[in-house]
Amino acid sequence: QERRFQLEGPESLTVQEGLCVLVPCRLPTTLPASYYGYGYWFLEGADVPVATNDPDEEVQEETRGRFHLLWDPRRKNCSLSIRDARRRDNAAYFFRLKSKWMKYGYTSSKLSVRVMALTHRPKILIPGTLEPGHSKNLTCSVSWACEQGTPPIFSWLSAAPTSLGPRTTHSSVLIITPRPQDHGTNLTCQVKFAGAGVTTERTIQLNVT
């Protein structure tokens, strides 16, 4: 007595490693009071859910803390939030609404999540020109990273005299006091998304005038 429903939207979604994706899911009906079960997202072919709101159910260790069921039956919402996407999240998923107390449940169609290599790169902002002996704040930002993801780790590489300035979740400030001999040298901002184990970087050449 399983009731099947179609997930709205595309049959597959693409996300880059380390980033986030929302798998949209909308219940086919407003649930009556008589049916008020728990929601589960499953990897195709698996018995243990990747995400659930059932307090008595374990989820797969690989997805714990990264996959979240955004459950709001009042708004028919059963979407799956994935953060810190990893290559091995590349799979087909489906949603199931089930209560062990009730005979019937609701099962969605499958949706494939494709996890691609991280091609986004950080942006380095230099306000104005670099002058010898004058300190400047350089900002490395990853505005394309998602809010709910694990905050990335920023690293700077430079031969010039530097110190670290303030950082936000998605940006880091480097205070640089360049010397004449630093002209033409490389400055690299490296950003590691530890939640997924991927790194991206950008290198610029310093123009000290």
């Epitope: 009556p32 009071a33 008020y36 709001d72 009042r74 062990k100 009730m102 005979k103």
Partner: antibody, heavy 114, light 107 residues
């Protein structure tokens, strides 16, 4: 019309047993979990027990665990509550309700007294 | 077990008044909260399920709100037939506990 009718209540001495029944009609009884809820005189509602649609899952309030048994017969559309080792504090109106508690019976009164 | 507390335990109000009853859970129960009305000698009647979903046939003057641990039942304009006892109940996990009730009587 969706209906639940409890029966089997009455006066019983402490330590004795009683079996309550709840006859269901107007809906597919075998698809729904069912509850027993009780209410002592002048007191609030107390959840007693729940049983899954097929009888494979059961859960009880701590106050009745080990003494009460919830069961069902889907072929007869009937829910049961077997109450053993009854105590004075079990005196109450006993209601059966479907899983969503949107359908309730009128209740049956159980009085435990010597 | 999840404990539910209700406030106030009783209140006196007049016809036409706006009445608010609160229910607090001892831990987060998401939106798995229901509200019931009970009149003396009668079985409880489901008013609101899933914290804010109005049960079929229940007048729109009843509304529910909240999520997590704090919930509210509001009667926008109290009618004579609304004088009763109101209970919250959680269906997040077993045991499916009820709150102690709030008695609404005539001022």
């Amino acid at each position: 019309e969706v209906q639940l009718v409890e029966s089997g209540g009455g006066l019983v001495q402490p330590g004795r047993s009683l079996r309550l029944s709840c006859a269901a009609s107007g809906f597919t009884f075998s698809s729904y979990g069912m509850h027993w809820v009780r209410q002592a005189p002048g007191k609030g509602l107390e959840w007693v027990a729940v049983i899954s649609y097929d009888g494979s899952n059961k859960y009880y309030a701590d106050s009745v665990k080990g003494r009460f048994t919830i069961s069902r017969d889907n072929s007869k559309n009937t829910l049961y509550l077997q109450m053993n080792s009854l105590r004075a504090e079990d005196t109450a109106v006993y209601y059966c309700a479907n899983y969503g508690m949107d359908v309730w019976g009128k209740g049956t009164t159980v009085t435990v007294s010597s | 077990a999840i404990r539910l507390t209700q406030s106030p335990s009783s209140l006196s109000a007049s016809v036409g008044d706006r009445v608010t009853i609160t229910c607090r859970a001892s831990q987060s129960i998401s939106s798995y909260l229901n509200w019931y009305q009970q009149k003396p000698g009668k079985a409880p009647k489901l008013l609101i399920y899933a914290a804010s979903s109005l049960q079929s046939g229940v007048p729109s003057r009843f509304s529910g709100s909240g999520s997590g641990t704090d919930f509210t039942l509001t009667i926008s304009s109290l009618q004579p037939e609304d004088f009763a006892t109101y209970y919250c109940q959680q269906s997040y996990g077993t045991p499916f506990t009820f709150g102690p009730g709030t008695k609404v009587d005539i001022k």
